[in-house]
Amino acid sequence: MSGLGRSRRGGRSRVDQEERFPQGLWTGVAMRSCPEEQYWDPLLGTCMSCKTICNHQSQRTCAAFCRSLSCRKEQGKFYDHLLRDCISCASICGQHPKQCAYFCENKLRSPVNLPPELRRQRSGEVENNSDNSGRYQGLEHRGSEASPALPGLKLSADQVALVYST
């Protein structure tokens, strides 16, 4: 974020230049934050969509947004907002979020490509030992949920623990 602060586009409060913070930053709208996925552009005096700068200079405020945008363009990957990282769906199929459903469901149709533990799960040999060995482990406890890719298969909180946000 620029030191000028960020402005909520569409805000109507007038900036009075007599009013200042000690640091010399203007008060009023220039100190308010922009809506999510926008940044304050001090030269435009406006909140702008982060999309406008992802291909240019990745301004601090937009860094996570721009990373998630480029991640979403990569097939078989999704952006995890808690990890702030681009995750390969291939590495978490079976304990995957909805963003990976298409990729993982297609992958699961050819069992040859599956790791041994998932092949066992598909053939009914579901082991009930939640020993934190889930490939994608807990960031957020959601309790026991059915895997979107394997209906009926219950996963432990440790295995599920996903951020289901796009």
Epitope: G3, Q17, G24, T52
Partner: antibody, heavy 118, light 107 residues
Framework: QVQLVESGGGVVQPGRSLRLSCAAS????????LHWVRQAPGKGLEWVAL????????YYADSVKGRFTISRDNSKNTLYLQMNSLRAEDTAVYYC???????????WGQGTLVTVSS | DIQMTQSPSSLSASVGDRVTITCRAS??????LGWYQQKPGKAPKRLIY???SLQSGVPSRFSGSGSGTEFTLTISSLQPEDFATYYC?????????FGGGTKVEIK
């Protein structure tokens, strides 16, 4: 393409007023903030004022605060600078400027000369 | 207000020379800085934005670096058309402030 064309400059006596205009084309005028920047003869650049896209927020250099008013008419795609109580030190070329901080967007008008002299 | 101190105020150089211009901010401004070139009777032209990003259409011999309070504009191999005055601009806080300028003259 983006065009910014200033007008309204001229010779004016100290203490009098003048209004500069900047006609804009080639971009969505009502979406962006615009600036006035000036340059006294043989001197450097001095930022004067900025107005937000909707005119609700205005920022001024200390040297013009209380004397100059920046405004805009989005229906006419025009930026204005109302200059009151003019002083000799306001003599300069005044540029209309439109720029973005983190993208390559940066456009300037050709400038209009204001001379404050008795 | 943030003061931008530019140095040198003028320099003489030959075609092919490497030229470095420095801008120092009176307080930290992150990378909220641009570099402008101006020729007599013309409007300024931006060369660099966000301290180090090259403006589209600007030759790659121009480069910017720095963050915080110290910034540099480098022309790797001076060309005849580069003889001009260069300004830095901080946009970290209002009022926006330009450096005093550096005039690059032919030796």
């Amino acid at each position: 393409q983006v065009q910014l064309v200033e007008s309204g400059g001229g010779v004016v006596q100290p203490g009098r007023s003048l209004r500069l205009s900047c006609a804009a084309s080639g971009f969505t005028f009502s979406s962006y903030g615009l600036h006035w920047v000036r340059q006294a003869p043989g001197k450097g650049l001095e930022w004067v004022a900025l107005i937000s896209y909707d005119g609700s927020n205005k920022y001024y250099a200390d040297s013009v605060k209380g004397r100059f008013t920046i405004s805009r008419d989005n229906s006419k795609n025009t930026l204005y600078l109302q200059m009151n109580s003019l002083r000799a030190e306001d003599t300069a070329v005044y540029y209309c400027w439109y720029s973005s901080s983190w993208t390559p967007l940066d456009y300037w008008g050709q400038g209009t000369l204001v001379t404050v002299s008795s | 207000d943030i003061q931008m101190t530019q140095s040198p105020s003028s320099l003489s150089a030959s075609v092919g020379d490497r030229v470095t211009i420095t801008c120092r901010a009176s307080q930290g401004i992150r990378n909220d800085l641009g570099w402008y070139q101006q020729k007599p009777g013309k409007a300024p032209k931006r060369l660099i934005y966000a301290a180090s990003s090259l403006q589209s259409g600007v030759p790659s011999r121009f480069s910017g670096s720095g963050s915080g309070t110290e910034f540099t504009l480098t022309i790797s191999s001076l060309q005849p058309e580069d003889f001009a005055t260069y300004y830095c601009l901080q946009y970290y806080s209002y009022p926006l402030t330009f450096g005093g300028g550096t005039k690059v003259e032919i030796k």
